[in-house]
């Protein structure tokens, strides 16, 4: 990546690391107003099956793993990259490496959910206050969770899907910031590891992952006012490991593995066509992104 | 039934190539990651490579990292392991193995082996 | 890497014979250790996995056992077919390591 100061734009999706081939210290980021991409200064260590995030209009990188034909080291780091400066600065280290990890924010706070050291499956969560640059872990998980898919809605956490150690899951828990508890909600229609997690207009959507047996290319939704999950329109590409974020009221799916190849694709979902069109494709292909929009 | 059937081995020159397969039967490769070990002759047991079926992620010991490539087609049920720039020390029976989640931890299935020999 | 230390590295017992086996690894690798049991010119077969669960269709006088770091494999009463070499391995980390093997041989 380039160490230039990054142009001042409005909103951008920020792709940090991912894999193929070995992990990798990629920072992109995709403007969606004019299909543009911009090279991005390097992640410190390169990185796969790591968590994006924005918090006051600087990005954060959380966990992962470096793969590498120099070996395979989960991470518990947490990097800040400053768009104004183009720059990375390290932050103070999570408890635990967590690979395949989930976050969330809530009120400015970082909360990072499962993920695996070697072949511990977490079910511990704790949280990232930036103002004091310090991490204290909060209840734990009902379920151990890697590749979980995370999201904030109503300022309640939802931890959805993953790989406890034995079994791909469907089921999901939610995390009630003021009780410092956990309880289950209703279980997806599908089995989904590495599937991509977000909100749009108050409900929680699943897109793709692994099933235990195949990639997956359905989409389904939560409401948390019927606490029932509904099938959307299926994505073009079956894909798991894949990138999620919202931007401007449509959802954007970036890369994965759909079995056989590391995408490139960039989908978009209309939740008012109910449509997912191709809209872009990285500069190459890869899974385990870290993927987060840039504040107005 | 679960089988696994190794082929490909056979008698190449250092610094040659070989592509080793991995035919499975009674069960879906998408559906475990499968692992090579080798063997060298007289000796013990050496892990070689693994594939994840959920991220696409691999891994290689370092003493292959580099060299060898390990790869899945699911729509023949068949994995791979491409051996370049090959060296004497990697002369050893290679057998593919499945990795179960139940049992936890551990390979559950092995192949027969494929014999590589390196020599001029 | 992690290093699995296996002893001995052979043995001589007699039918009927209790026999133990020991790993030690170089670091904390929890539960994650199997055991395989692998006869000349075949390939290994799981005995143990998650250091002391017997798999499917293996005899019940195998067993495992872990003591922190240390990993024992018995056989309570040796049989015929139980003559071969015996294998740890463990799977907290990758990449994964075997232990240098265990000849148990006739007396």
């Known amino acids: 990546g380039s160490m230039g100061h990054a142009p001042k734009v409005g909103r951008l999706i920020y792709t940090a690391g991912g894999y193929f081939r070995q992990s990798l210290s990629y920072l992109e980021a995709y403007n969606p107003s004019d299909g543009t991409w911009l090279d991005l200064a390097d992640l410190q260590v390169p990185r796969s099956g790591l968590a994006g995030c924005v918090v006051g209009g600087l990005l954060y990188a959380v966990g992962g793993r470096n793969n590498s034909p120099d070996g395979n080291t989960d991470s518990s780091a947490l990097d800040c990259y400053n768009p104004m400066t183009n720059q990375w600065s390290p932050c103070a280290p999570m408890s635990v490496p967590r690979n395949r990890i989930g976050v969330g924010v809530i009120d400015g706070h970082i909360y990072a959910v499962g993920g695996s050291h070697g072949c511990i499956h977490h079910n511990s969560v704790e949280r990232y206050e930036p103002e004091r640059d310090e991490w204290h872990l909060v209840a734990p998980m009902l379920t151990r969770r890697i590749g979980v898919g995370v999201a904030v809605l109503n300022r309640l956490l939802y931890a959805v899907g993953g790989f406890d150690g034995t079994n791909r899951l469907n089921s999901a828990e939610c995390y009630y910031p003021e009780r410092n508890e956990w309880r289950m909600i209703t279980a997806m229609n599908t089995i989904r590891s590495g599937a991509g997690v977000c909100v749009l207009h108050n409900c929680i959507y699943a897109a793709g992952g692994y099933d235990g047996q195949d990639q997956l290319n359905s989409v389904e939704r939560y409401d948390v006012e019927t606490e029932t999950w509904t099938f959307v329109a299926p994505m073009k590409h079956r894909r798991s490991a894949l990138g999620i974020t919202v931007h401007q009221g449509r959802i954007y799916v970036l890369g994965g593995y759909d079995g056989h190849t590391f995408l490139d694709s960039v989908e978009c979902y209309d939740p008012d066509t109910d449509t997912w069109s191709e809209v872009t494709r990285m500069t190459s292909g890869r899974s385990g992104v870290g993927v987060a929009v840039t504040m107005e | 039934e679960v089988q696994l059937v190794e082929s490909g081995g056979g008698l190449v020159q250092p610094g040659g190539s070989l592509r080793l397969s991995c035919a499975a039967s009674g069960f879906a490769i998408s559906a475990s990651s499968i692992h090579w070990v080798r063997q060298a002759p007289g000796k013990g047991l050496e892990w070689v490579a693994s594939i994840d079926p959920e991220t696409g992620e691999t891994l290689y010991a370092k003493s292959v990292a580099g060299r060898f490539t390990i790869s899945a087609d699911t729509s023949k049920n068949t994995a791979y392991l491409q051996m370049n720039s090959l060296r004497a020390e990697d002369t050893a029976v290679y057998y593919c193995?499945?990795?179960?989640?139940?049992?936890?931890?551990?390979?559950?299935?092995w192949g027969q082996g494929t014999l590589v020999t390196v020599s001029s | 890497d992690i290093q699995m230390t296996q002893s001995p590295s052979s043995l001589s017992a007699s039918v009927g014979d209790r026999v133990t086996i020991t790993c030690r690894a170089s670091?904390?690798?929890?539960?994650?250790v199997a055991w395989y049991q692998q006869k000349p010119g075949k390939a290994p077969k799981l005995l143990i996995y998650?250091?002391?669960s017997l798999y499917s269709g293996v005899p019940s006088r195998f067993s495992g056992s872990r003591s922190g770091t240390d990993f024992t494999l018995t056989i309570s009463s040796l049989q015929p077919e139980d003559f071969a070499t015996y294998y740890c391995?463990?799977?907290?980390?990758?990449?994964?390591?075997f232990g240098q093997g265990t000849k148990v041989e006739i007396k």
């Open positions: 391995q463990q799977s907290y980390s990758f990449p994964s390591t």
């Open positions: 998650s250091a002391s």
């Open positions: 193995a499945r990795w179960g989640y139940e049992p936890y931890m551990a390979m559950d299935y």
């Open positions: 670091q904390s690798v929890s539960s994650a």
